[in-house]
């Protein structure tokens, strides 16, 4: 028969030949020949492969390094590299998560929109009118000017996207 | 083009220890397994088993465990079988061959007698 | 271990006459993937071994179309349609699907 160009899926052509790819989790150790199936072996502890493959050699098992405030998500298998992501106060710096930064704090004038989570930093907005925010925070949200009319009080100071209003007593000598 | 040189022949005294070598050029090295292959007379042709050089990983039959040891050197593209406490049983031509098409040595044939 | 079991053990023959070597395993020789390690060597005095037919029926590299394999599971046969005076030697089946790899014992092609 004619050597094939061109193999099913799992396999790959070598010298003429269609072998057996090696499962995720495995690594090649020789290719088939016309005596032998293509060998794989297990890849060892702490490395892994996620793909059918003709790999040599496992990749290694992502370190989290909590010198960079890393610590494990989901612990690596054979065939899946482990997952990190940030102490609790931090988040990472790219989707690959290799390192992590403080979340950042709101300034006086601006709100939390969105808490950051490990994976994404704090997400603020500029307080609207009628909201204020006097303090840096990565928690606060933008709060609403008190309301003096509820408390049978009258605006004293106006307030502004960093303060609250102030309310005092209604002039008694008005009608 | 591929090449499988083996060592010349031997006489050795029984209980001695005999290391055959087996050369091979003109592909790489690591990429094939080599099996070994004894040869008596009337005893028709017996797989001994087969190293993967530079890895080292080995399979051998197990009626030879104890009896060959597969070993390679990569630095000189050889694999070499040590056959060891000698017997006139173990007088044979012995074969290395690649796993993968038809490439053999020329055989070493091992004498043992006292 | 699988035992091989070639017949006949001897097979005079004329030149031009077919030759059929029958090699039969004492368990299957298909793997999990369908494959069936079956194979066909010729060796000649003081000669190494040459691979005729690999995986029952593929004809080695150089070697002439009057050489053909076929079987499956445990019998095999090797037919050689058209003997020449080059043909002659000792044929052995091989086995490479399970550990340890077997031969078979050896069929002598000789002239009648």
């Known amino acids: 028969p004619e050597p094939p160009t061109a193999c099913r899926e799992k396999q790959y052509l070598i010298n003429s030949q269609c072998c057996s790819l090696c499962q995720p989790g495995q690594k090649l150790v020789s290719d088939c020949t016309e005596f032998t199936e293509t060998e794989c072996l297990p890849c060892g502890e702490s490395e892994f492969l996620d793909t059918w493959n003709r790999e040599t050699h496992c990749h290694q098992h992502k370190y989290c390094d909590p010198n960079l405030g890393l610590r494990v998500q989901q612990k690596g298998t054979s065939e899946t590299d482990t997952i990190c992501t940030c102490e609790e106060g931090w988040h990472c710096t790219s989707e690959a998560c290799e390192s992590c930064v403080l979340h950042r704090s709101c300034s006086p004038g601006f709100g939390v929109k969105q808490i950051a989570t490990g994976v994404s930093d704090t997400i603020c907005e500029p307080c609207p009118v009628g909201f204020f925010s006097n303090v840096s925070s990565a928690f606060e949200k933008c709060h609403p000017w008190t309301s003096c009319e509820t408390k049978d009080l009258v605006v004293q100071q106006a307030g502004t996207n960093k303060t609250d209003v102030v309310c005092g007593p209604q002039d008694r000598l008005r009608a | 083009q591929v090449q499988l040189q083996q060592s010349g022949a031997e006489l050795m005294k029984p209980g001695a220890s005999a290391k055959l070598s087996c050369k091979a050029t003109g592909y790489t090295f690591t990429g094939y397994w080599i099996q070994w292959v004894k040869q008596r007379p009337g005893h028709g042709l017996e797989w001994i088993g087969e190293i993967l050089p530079g890895g080292d990983h080995t399979k051998y039959n197990e009626k030879f465990r104890g009896k060959a040891t597969f070993t390679s050197d990569t630095s000189s593209n050889t694999v070499y079988m040590q056959l060891s406490s000698l017997t006139t049983e173990d007088s044979a031509i012995y074969y290395c061959a690649r796993v993968g098409g038809d490439y053999w040595g020329q055989g070493t044939t091992l004498t043992v007698s006292s | 271990d699988v035992v091989m079991t070639q017949t006949p053990l001897s097979l005079p023959v004329s030149l031009g006459d077919q030759a059929s070597i029958s090699c039969r395993s004492s368990?299957?020789?298909?793997?999990?993937?369908?494959?069936?390690?079956l194979h066909w060597y010729l060796q000649k005095p003081g000669q190494s071994p040459k691979l005729l037919i690999y995986k029952v029926f593929n004809r080695y590299s150089g070697v002439p179309d009057r050489f053909s394999g076929s079987g499956s599971g445990t019998d095999f046969t090797l037919k050689i349609s058209r003997v020449e005076a080059e043909d002659l030697g000792v044929y052995f089946c091989f086995q490479s699907t399970h550990v340890p790899w077997t031969f078979g014992g050896g069929t002598k092609l000789e002239i009648k």
């Open positions: 368990q299957s020789l298909v793997n999990s993937n369908e494959n069936t390690y």
